[in-house]
């Protein structure tokens, strides 16, 4: 019988008492085969973290800073359940740390030196740790003691709770630096008042502070937010302009064997019976003998944290950077305007080979990081382990939802001004063998399908989106008799046709021979009835252009396209017979790396781009013998995006809507995780 006990860790007598009450009340409402609570008492949160890591306890609820500690080795804990605030309809699990300024003040984030600062309090998250952590490497040396460095960075501050004797500049705007509401500039509202009164130039608070203090929109319009990219935005655009997004209060567990499903089952049942306004005799979110015991008193309920989400992703790149800077206190030798090497994310060992070759030829401008799937690469870019990669539009969508931005687009047509002219896109098509003359768009049910990969544009999002509109369900593996759609569940019929050996079967990388455009076409040639690819795929792999044994004798004339009106056309008539126009592949990165990735990639393509004529004796960035490694092989150049510099603008309203409709069919664990952070 599996042990269904969750050992909750309590950090005080009062918490232990509430925990025992929680245990007893749960016993009274949950059947004997359901989850139960046991209580473990420790002296501190850090002791609780160690106890969970050592399998002496299973769960505890922590503030963001402690979630970071819990994640660090050797603890390796992960977030499993989040408290939410506000309403069930609009649950808030995060708040945003922001830098508020007056509208007419005219400086940016990188010009804060010498300004006057208002803080909620020394050592507090939004008011101190996050802004000072992010500014850490700009502080004058020596950076220890930190208070002294901060005092020398700003021309005056109010940092309640600071030592006014040792660091008078930190109390210059609020004499005494009182650590309670007796100090008019203490806390969120106090720090905002410090700005409003004109004492300070910038207030470090949370996104809701300005709304709580200024009910009138006209008054709020006198203020702006400083963004990390050295721009400003209106105060209601905090989701796109903040210092960090911070989880409020989170239950953590072991990463391996951590009982996360059991913990969720327990807490979900607990909120049903003892949540807000549920029971008089025991309330989960109330602390008669103290404050915030086990859970925050202000919480309204729990949400399950998606399983794909580790602590780094949950806390977010900015928050982790700020806290790591403060804790480790390490900075680059001297901040320079020169770009650091771009860490390119390579998928599996084929891309890694090409990336290694690029790296040595780039003389230190490019470094390589490996991952097994595109989603793993996106996650690595999000958390700073990697910086950039080129993605199909379907993954540009996921990357965008995860906070990454497109920076350059692949262009596939030769033109005089390639780098300045991003193209409208390529065509997604359905290819069949000419010999299967009865096959049309309208009778694909029960046929064998070949896809580039799940989540990709031409191979999945466009054809499956059109199919979904017809069949109104997501069971595509029942619609086709079998197929190869790399990235599907291994036991799905959509992995049956795949050719990868062992663990590589149906993997969404080049270890699966039927992966990508060329792979999907090969799948059609060898096993399938229809392939969903791009309009250039057939000509690129026929007429001897692909020398691989399976392709070298193929003839373009032996294939036709399926048109949406039920007719068929020759391959060259793709402009009048396609499923949809697809956005070109694009390079994505984090916002903080955008300028450097843009600069370095433009240099790299001038050295190794289409201007290189002999690829047998020189490194060619856009060539890999039909394998589309790192970039599509038909890339002519990487083009500037001009104003199409967000994923929505880049992909276009129509495509974003189409992928949005398919979201209900999505199996992307990363998309689920990212929409948890930003619904």
């Amino acid at each position: 019988v599996p042990d269904k006990t969750v050992r909750w860790c309590a950090v005080s007598e009062h918490e232990a008492t509430k925990c025992q009450s929680f245990r007893d009340h749960m016993k009274s409402v949950i059947p004997s085969d359901g989850p139960s609570v046991a209580c473990v008492k420790k002296a501190s949160y850090l002791d609780c973290i160690r106890a969970i890591a050592a399998n002496e306890a299973d769960a505890v609820t922590l503030d963001a800073g402690l979630v970071y500690d819990a994640y660090l080795a050797p603890n390796n804990l992960k977030p499993v359940v989040a408290e939410f605030y506000g309403s069930k309809e609009d649950p808030q699990t995060f708040y945003y740390a922001v830098a508020v300024v007056k509208k007419d003040s005219g400086f940016q984030m990188n010009q804060l030196r010498g300004k006057k600062s208002c803080h909620t309090g020394l050592g507090r998250s939004a008011g101190w740790n996050i802004p000072i952590g992010l500014l850490y490497c700009d502080l004058p040396e020596p950076r220890k003691p930190l208070e002294k460095a901060v005092a020398n960075f700003f021309s005056g501050s109010c940092a309640p709770c600071a030592d006014g004797t040792d660091f008078p500049q930190l109390c210059q705007l609020c004499p005494g630096c009182g650590c309670s509401t007796l100090n008019q500039y203490f806390g969120y509202s106090g720090a905002f008042k410090c700005l409003k009164d004109g004492a300070g130039d910038v207030a470090f608070v949370k996104h809701s502070t300005i709304f709580e203090n200024l009910a009138n929109k006209a008054d709020r319009d006198q203020y702006e937010l400083l963004c990390l990219d050295n721009t400003r935005k209106p105060v209601d655009e905090y989701k796109d302009c903040h210092l960090a997004q911070v989880p409020s209060h989170t239950v953590v567990a072991r990463s391996m064997g951590g009982k996360e499903d059991l913990i969720w089952e327990l807490l979900n049942q607990a909120q049903e019976h003892f949540g807000k306004d549920k029971s008089k005799e025991f309330q989960l979110f109330s602390s008669p003998h103290g404050k915030d015991l086990l859970f925050k008193d202000s919480a309204h309920g729990f949400l399950k944290v998606p399983p794909r989400m580790d602590a780094k992703m949950y806390l977010g790149y900015e928050y982790v950077t700020a806290i790591r800077n403060l804790r480790e206190g390490t900075c680059p030798e001297a901040p320079t305007d020169e770009c650091k090497p771009v860490k390119w994310c390579a998928l599996s060992h084929h891309e890694r080979l090409k990336c290694d070759e690029w790296s040595v030829n780039s003389v230190g401008k490019i470094e390589c990081v490996s991952a097994e799937t595109t989603e793993d690469c996106i996650a690595k870019i999000m958390n700073g382990e990697a910086d950039a990669m080129s993605l199909d539009g379907g993954f540009v969508y996921i990357a965008g939802k995860c906070g990454l931005v497109p920076v350059l687009a692949e262009n596939y047509n030769k033109s005089d001004n390639c780098e300045d002219t991003p193209e409208a896109g390529y065509f997604a098509i359905a290819v069949v063998k000419k010999s299967a003359s009865d096959l049309t768009w309208d009778n694909l049910k029960g046929k064998k399908s070949c896809h580039t990969a799940v989540g990709r544009t031409a191979g999945w999002n466009i054809p499956m989106g059109l199919l979904y509109n017809k069949i109104n369900h997501c069971r595509f593996d029942e619609f086709f008799s079998e197929g190869c759609a790399p990235g599907s569940k291994k036991d799905s019929s959509l992995c049956k046709l795949c050719m990868g050996s062992g663990l590589n079967l149906c993997e969404p990388n080049n270890k699966e021979g039927y992966y990508g455009y060329t792979g999907a076409f090969r799948c059609l040639v060898e096993k399938g009835d229809v392939a969903f690819v791009k309009h250039q795929t057939v000509p690129q792999n026929t007429g001897g252009k692909n020398p691989d044994p399976w392709a070298k004798n193929l003839n373009e004339k032996d294939y036709e396209l399926l048109c949406l009106d039920g007719t068929r056309k020759p391959v060259e008539e793709y402009a009048n017979c396609h499923l949809a126009r697809a956005p070109n592949h694009a390079v994505v990165t984090r916002k903080d790396k955008e300028a450097c990735v843009h600069k370095i990639l433009r240099q790299q393509q001038h050295l190794f781009g289409s201007n290189v004529t002999d690829c047998s004796g020189n490194f060619c960035l856009f060539r890999s013998e039909t394998k589309d490694l790192l970039f599509r092989d038909d890339t002519v150049c990487l083009a500037k995006l001009h104003d199409r510099n967000t994923y929505e603008k880049y992909l276009g309203e129509e495509y974003v809507k189409a992928v949005g409709n398919l979201r209900k069919c999505s199996t992307s664990s990363l998309l689920e995780a990212c929409t948890f952070r930003r619904p």
């Epitope: 084929h350 080979l353 090409k354 070759e357 080049n510 004796g617 020189n618 490194f619 013998e625 394998k627």
Partner: nanobody, 117 residues
Framework: QVKLEESGGGLVQPGGSLRLSCAAS????????MGWYRQRPGKQRELVAA???????NYADSVKGRFSISRDNAKNTMYLQMNSLKPEDTAVYYC???????????WGQGTQVTVSS
């Protein structure tokens, strides 16, 4: 297409040295980039060092300062000088010229290096 053959491996004590050679069946002068990879038991093949025709080099962090890559275009040979060897350097070492056959997983036999006391 030029064929490459690795040699020079063997058993060596920790702290010892070895020099691996990669001999080509034809001219390597026109080959832009060459590299050494290794595969440790149960692990993915990984880059050890790479070198371009112009002499730019790149090393894995774990071998920086201990290993040195070079090529002699006149002798159509590339070398890997390995000093201060550690047990974790134990692997099969392969050389590559980054031609299309490596994207097809068509690698040579490699040469076994074992570092043990």
């Amino acid at each position: 297409q030029v064929k490459l053959e690795e040699s020079g491996g063997g058993l060596v004590q920790p702290g010892g040295s070895l020099r691996l050679s990669c001999a080509a069946s034809g001219s390597i002068f026109s080959i832009n980039t060459m590299g050494w990879y290794r595969q440790r038991p149960g692990k993915q093949r990984e880059l050890v060092a790479a070198i371009t025709r112009g002499g730019n080099t790149n090393y894995a962090d774990s071998v920086k300062g201990r290993f040195s890559i070079s090529r002699d275009n006149a002798k159509n040979t590339m070398y890997l000088q390995m000093n201060s060897l550690k047990p974790e350097d134990t692997a099969v070492y392969y050389c590559t010229d980054y031609s299309r056959r490596y994207y097809q997983d068509d690698w040579g036999q490699g040469t076994q290096v074992t570092v043990s006391s």
